[in-house]
Amino acid sequence: TALSPAPTTMDFTPAPLEDTSSRPQFCKWPCECPPSPPRCPLGVSLITDGCECCKMCAQQLGDNCTEAAICDPHRGLYCDYSGDRPRYAIGVCAQVVGVGCVLDGVRYNNGQSFQPNCKYNCTCIDGAVGCTPLCLRVRPPRLWCPHPRRVSIPGHCCEQWVCEDDAKRPRKTAPRDTGAFDAVGEVEAWHRNCIAYTSPWSPCSTSCGLGVSTRISNVNAQCWPEQESRLCNLRPCDVDIHTLIKAGKKCLAVYQPEASMNFTLAGCISTRSYQPKYCGVCMDNRCCIPYKSKTIDVSFQCPDGLGFSRQVLWINACFCNLSCRNPNDIFADLESYPDFSEIAN
């Protein structure tokens, strides 16, 4: 069994034209599709082509693209037609450049690392700034110093501990060679120096079936940006949700199967059953995506007796977004932004 079923033939032969001087048409109506959908390589999205006709494997970075053969939206790709002037018919799939950041009036590029001052090293990550402290987390001299105090010393960037003795004369503290220090206090001091940052979850890597979503967070003991992942399933691939849309309606925002079910992953089964909600479909040219969701922890039991747990996207509500594909759509980024309740999860 292939992980995900892939593309219809994409040889970019335009359909016959009445007017040969005009831009080529890559869509034919009525739709002509092969009897069974293609099967995609691992990690390649099976999507509906740009003609809204047939299933195809999404074009990847560096591939040619047309209005029919569209770039993989789950990999942040768009069709760059700039090399095909003046026709703008055949483009190349390119990466959407991440959003830059502005901090204290200074603009930084996506991915750029910088030091806003001598105390922090920061990185711009898709519009948000994550920082890690450069000043060493020196422990306060509790054992022999009754009144430790951190002070700025001229010529030094980082504050240092001084000890206020009975004569109220500050003296610089010496390092102690003792293990009798409360480690919790050190972690708390560390986190006071750490600007906590968690990016929004990325969109699910597949439009149907099991996918993955990632985010970057420095909420850890090292305050170091790490990638977290969670499983996601926006909608089942084997259910034609279009048939469930009531007459006269343009959307079915949420689809929920009647029976509860167990999640399966790599031959392992969830230890309890769930009744998940899925995003539905929109009849017009919009995509149905989660806007109220959270992350739950699902435990799996495997046939060999081993078990593991995974973070999984839990959908509460969905809505029809304006556009799934247009890279110039300023609202398209909403797809990757969860509601506030999710950030706490």
């Epitope: 892939a6 390589p41 970075l61 992953l265």
Partner: antibody, heavy 119, light 110 residues
Framework: QMQLVQSGAEVKEPGSSVKVSCKAS??????LNWVRQAPGQGLEWMGG????????NYAQKFEGRVTITADESTNTAYMEISSLRFEDTAMYYC??????????????WGQGTLVTVSS | QAVLTQPPSVSKGLRQTATLTCTGD????????AAWLQQHPGLPPKVLSY???SRPSGISERLFVSRSGNSASLTITGLQPEDEADYYC???????????FGGGTQLTVL
């Protein structure tokens, strides 16, 4: 630099099983594929897995007799063949796709693991 | 039995040009193109070109790849002794849902 490090050579008896590992440096969201090459023969794709997903993809010929698994935390893929036959004697390669080009999974190759089936 | 068809061997003289061919059908080469691999004896294969005919960095500019319909070709100009190796084409087959290879072409530089 991307690296794929495979486990060492194995000598097995017919009917037994063998499990070969492939540890990849870097991102665990790229497919790791298994390709075998019998002595003096061509390349044959067996299947693949994305460690972060954990769901394998098999060539029809190997379905049922080959099990591909992965450990997401160590970014390691495993390929196990059961009911070994003499004709399974081959060099087994692990190959990872390159950045962005999803239809070219063969940018990075492990050094290969020689599996010999002998009685 | 290899899904993609390649000539078993090609022999050319030093500094000459060799063209290797790979024929498939509309569900593999004709669909998404082919990638080319080079393999020297006792070593793992090495990718020479992507299926969109571009070359990875560090691969000689003496190599040219092209595709027409269901066939792909690899042309090596100014043949050198180090070009003597086995060459394989590979493609994703969207009907089989599998990576497929050619049987390989042994290139001999005389």
């Amino acid at each position: 630099q991307m690296q794929l490090v495979q486990s060492g050579a194995e000598v097995k008896e017919p009917g037994s099983s063998v499990k070969v590992s492939c540890k990849a440096s870097g991102d665990n969201s790229y497919p790791l594929n298994w390709v075998r090459q019998a002595p003096g023969q061509g390349l044959e794709w067996m299947g693949g897995i994305i460690p972060i997903f954990g769901t394998p993809n098999y060539a029809q010929k190997f379905e049922g007799r080959v099990t591909i698994t992965a450990d997401e935390s160590t970014n390691t893929a495993y390929m196990e063949i059961s009911s070994l036959r003499f004709e399974d004697t081959a060099m087994y390669y692990c190959a990872r796709e390159g950045d962005g080009y999803n239809y070219s999974p063969l940018d990075y190759w492990g050094q290969g693991t020689l599996v010999t089936v002998s009685s | 039995q290899a899904v993609l068809t390649q000539p078993p061997s090609v022999s050319k003289g030093l500094r000459q040009t060799a063209t290797l061919t790979c024929t498939g059908d509309s569900s593999n080469v004709g669909n998404q193109g082919a990638a080319w691999l080079q393999q020297h004896p006792g070593l793992p294969p090495k990718v020479l070109s992507y299926r969109n005919n571009s070359r990875p960095s560090g691969i000689s500019e003496r190599l040219f790849v092209s595709r027409s319909g269901n066939s792909a070709s690899l042309t090596i100009t100014g043949l050198q002794p180090e070009d003597e190796a086995d060459y394989y084409c590979s493609a994703w087959d969207s009907s089989l849902g599998a990576w497929v290879f050619g049987g390989g072409t042994q290139l001999t530089v005389l």
